[in-house]
C-alpha cells in the first residue's frame, strides 16, 4: 500500500511516524497533523543576522 513519502532523519533519531497523504508529519511532536497546523520558517530578509524564529510545530522536510 502506498503511504505518504517518508523523509530521512539522523541516524540516532527514531523513524518518523508515517502519515496518510492527507496529513503532514510534525517533527517536533513526532506525529501526524493537518498540514495547515505546520508553519514553515519565513525566508530571512537580506542582511538579517538572526535566524527566523521557529514555531511549535515544524514540518519534516
Amino acid at each position: 500500500m502506498r503511504r505518504g513519502p517518508r523523509s530521512l532523519r539522523g541516524r540516532d533519531a527514531p523513524a518518523p511516524t508515517p502519515c496518510v497523504p492527507a496529513e503532514c508529519f510534525a517533527l517536533l511532536v513526532r506525529h501526524c497533523v493537518a498540514c495547515g497546523l505546520l508553519r514553515t520558517p519565513r525566508p530571512k530578509p537580506a542582511g538579517a543576522s538572526s535566524p527566523a524564529p521557529r514555531t511549535a510545530l515544524q514540518p519534516q522536510e
Epitope: 508515517p18 496518510v20 492527507a22 506525529h31 493537518a34 498540514c35 497546523l37
Partner: antibody, heavy 118, light 113 residues
Framework: EVKLVESGGGLVQPGGSLRLSCAIS????????MSWVRQPPGKALEWLGF??????????EYNPSVKGRFTISRDNSQSIFYLQMNTLRAEDSATYYC?????????WGQGTTVTVSA | DIVMSQSPSSLAVSVGEKVTMSCKSS????????????LAWYQQKPGQSPKLLIY???TRESGVPDRFTGSGSGTDFTLTISSVKAEDLAVYYC?????????FGGGTKLEIK
C-alpha cells in the same frame, strides 16, 4: 474491493445515546484512518472527526461542534469502527457516513439514519 | 474554522455543455512546503453517498472520467465538467482538509435540462 457498511441508526429521544458501527472489509483495518461525516436531511455535509491508524497510536481528532459528546473508537479484531453519541439533540438528526481517509475522504459507506425526536 | 463557499448553489445545463462551479475558502489551503492545496471535490448523486472525484485541488481520483477537472490554488478553486452527461446529475461539494475541523461547502446542485 473496499467496503464500508454502517449500522446502528434509528430513533432516539433527546438526551439519549446511540452507538453507530462501521463494518470494514477489503483493506487492512489497522493501516488506515477512519472518519465519520454526517448530513442532515437536505443539507450539506459535516465532518465529525477521525481516528488514526496503528502507526499513529489510534489517536483522534474531533470537530469542536461534537467534541465531548461524540467518541470515535475501533475494534480492529472485528474490523469495526464506532461512533458513540451521547446527550443527543434534535439537530443531531442526520444520515451518518463512515469514510476511509487517505488522500482525502476516499471511500464512503452507504450511511445510516439517526432521528432524534421525542 | 475555515469557511467554504460554493457558487452557484444550483445550475441547469443541457447534455454536452461545459459546466464550471466555484469554491472559495476563507483562508489559503496551500501548504508551501509541498505546494499542495488541501482541497477535495465530491459528487453525491441522489440517494447515494458522496464519492471522491478530486483531491489536492487538481488530482483526479482513480476511475473518475477525465471530463472532470479541478483547478485553482490558495483560496479560489473550480470544478469543470467539460461535456456534461445525464449521469452527472448530482450535488458537488468541495471540502478543505488543510486544518481541523475539516469543512465542506454548501454544495452546487447540477440539474440536467
Amino acid at each position: 474491493e473496499v467496503k464500508l457498511v454502517e449500522s446502528g441508526g434509528g430513533l432516539v429521544q433527546p438526551g439519549g445515546s446511540l452507538r453507530l458501527s462501521c463494518a470494514i472489509s477489503g483493506f487492512t483495518v489497522t493501516a488506515y484512518y477512519m472518519s465519520w461525516v454526517r448530513q442532515p436531511p437536505g443539507k450539506a455535509l459535516e465532518w465529525l472527526g477521525f481516528i488514526r491508524d496503528k502507526a499513529n497510536g489510534y489517536t483522534t481528532e474531533y470537530n469542536p461542534s461534537v467534541k465531548g459528546r461524540f467518541t470515535i473508537s475501533r475494534d480492529n479484531s472485528q474490523s469495526i469502527f464506532y461512533l458513540q453519541m451521547n446527550t443527543l439533540r434534535a439537530e443531531d438528526s442526520a444520515t451518518y457516513y463512515c469514510a476511509q481517509v487517505r488522500r482525502a475522504l476516499d471511500y464512503w459507506g452507504q450511511g445510516t439514519t439517526v432521528t432524534v425526536s421525542a | 474554522d475555515i469557511v467554504m463557499s460554493q457558487s452557484p448553489s444550483s445550475l441547469a445545463v443541457s447534455v454536452g455543455e461545459k459546466v464550471t462551479m466555484s469554491c472559495k475558502s476563507s483562508q489559503s489551503l496551500l501548504y508551501s512546503s509541498n505546494q499542495n492545496n488541501y482541497l477535495a471535490w465530491y459528487q453525491q448523486k441522489p440517494g447515494q453517498s458522496p464519492k471522491l472525484l478530486i483531491y489536492w485541488a487538481s488530482t483526479r481520483e482513480s476511475g473518475v472520467p477525465d471530463r472532470f477537472t479541478g483547478s485553482g490554488s490558495g483560496t479560489d478553486f473550480t470544478l469543470t465538467i467539460s461535456s456534461v452527461k445525464a449521469e452527472d446529475l448530482a450535488v458537488y461539494y468541495c471540502q478543505q482538509y488543510y486544518t481541523y475541523p475539516y469543512t465542506f461547502g454548501g454544495g452546487t446542485k447540477l440539474e440536467i435540462k
